[in-house]
Interface confidence: low
């Protein structure tokens, strides 16, 4: 769930999920929609489309929770249910792809109004 | 169009094994969980457990962790379920089912009889 | 795991009458889904994500509820309509069903 997000998000970038990440850009955050502005938010497109594939099978993104290690910079997903398990896959591919984007995070893009992404 | 069709009726003795199996057709087999249900005479449904054949991953609910074992081939677009330890609890009918994004399409399900 | 309490067990109900079919979930769940099941035969999807139609079932049923309050509601109940109807949850694992409510015609 969103709760496993945030602490991965954290302990992959070392930067708070919820300032830095969850209204960058275009498509970081809730909604999503015209072009991703930048690396950062390039990796939240993918993410989103990740979290839809999984909501067509039925699972629930916003609730369902998972279990995941975490150790030597490296995230592993705890075996499970398919759920669970893809769920964790598609976040720890995002924190993956935001702390290969860190050098590029712009500042002007923490907030971005949604209006002007189109 | 999708079909899961399962085997045959199965009498086995108290104390033995039992496989039965659930072909996919009409579908790309590994894209989808496979749940396996359970329904005694009578009674409502249990879930028994899922397996994703893309990876192999199975989830089972703890009631029969060690009764039940899920396997797929991919080879053949085939689910499989044995039971094992069998006593007259396990005298049911089982039944196969694809998840997308519920139970969409359900086999016509497997009577086991479980008696000496 | 979550428990699927589906009131009443059995009822029966005229040609034309209304009929409401309630699953009171143990803990708060994200969506409920509905299976139509005749004697000898497979269950059948019939509402899923708590509102939505599965292919094939008539318009005069409909689904509704949240949190942990669910219901199946028939407008007009026919002939074709009696049969068992389960609730189930996806919300967190185990999956579990509702006990059944048996739907006769009167």
């Known amino acids: 769930g969103l709760l496993d997000l945030k602490s991965m998000i954290e302990k992959v970038t070392g930067k708070n999920a919820l300032t830095n990440y969850g209204f960058y850009g275009c498509y970081c955050g809730w909604g999503g929609r015209g072009t991703p502005k930048d690396g950062t938010d390039w990796c939240c497109w993918a993410h989103d489309h990740c979290y839809g594939r999984l909501e067509e099978k039925g699972c629930n993104i916003r609730t369902q929770s998972y279990k995941y290690r975490f150790a030597w910079g490296v995230v592993t997903c705890e075996p499970g249910p398919f759920c669970h398990v893809n769920l964790c896959a598609c976040d720890r591919k995002l924190v993956y792809c935001l702390k290969r984007n860190l050098r590029s995070y712009n500042p002007q893009y923490q907030y971005f109004p949604n209006i002007l992404c189109s | 169009q999708v079909q899961l069709q399962q085997s045959g009726p199965e009498l086995v003795k108290p104390g033995a094994s039992v496989k039965m199996s659930c072909k996919a057709s009409?579908?790309?087999?590994?894209?989808?969980?496979i749940t396996w249900v359970k329904q005694r005479t009578g009674q409502g449904l249990e879930w028994i457990g899922e397996?994703?054949?893309?990876?192999?991953?199975?989830y089972y609910d703890e009631k029969f962790k060690g009764k039940a074992t899920l396997t797929a081939d991919k080879s053949s677009n085939t689910a499989y379920m044995q039971l094992s330890s069998m006593t007259s609890e396990d005298s049911a009918v089982y039944f196969c089912?694809?998840?997308?994004?519920?139970?969409?399409?359900w086999g016509q399900g497997t009577t086991l009889t479980v008696s000496s | 795991q979550i428990v699927l309490t589906q009131s009443p067990a059995i009822m029966s109900a005229s040609p034309g009458e209304k009929v409401t079919i309630s699953c009171s979930a143990s803990?708060?769940?994200?969506?409920m889904y509905w299976y139509q099941q005749k004697p000898g035969s497979s269950p059948k999807p019939w509402i899923y994500?708590?509102?939505n139609l599965a292919s094939g079932v008539p318009a005069r049923f409909s689904g509704s509820g949240s949190g942990t309050s669910y219901s199946l509601t028939i407008s007009s109940m026919e002939a074709e309509d009696a049969a068992t109807y389960y609730c189930?949850?996806?919300?967190?694992?185990?999956?579990?069903f509702g006990a059944g409510t048996k739907l006769e015609l009167k």
């Open positions: 994500r708590t509102s």
């Open positions: 397996i994703y054949p893309g990876s192999g991953s199975t």
């Open positions: 803990s708060s769940v994200s969506y």
């Open positions: 189930q949850q996806y919300h967190s694992y185990p999956l579990t």
């Open positions: 009409g579908y790309t087999f590994t894209d989808y969980v």
């Open positions: 089912a694809r998840w997308f994004p519920y139970f969409d399409y």
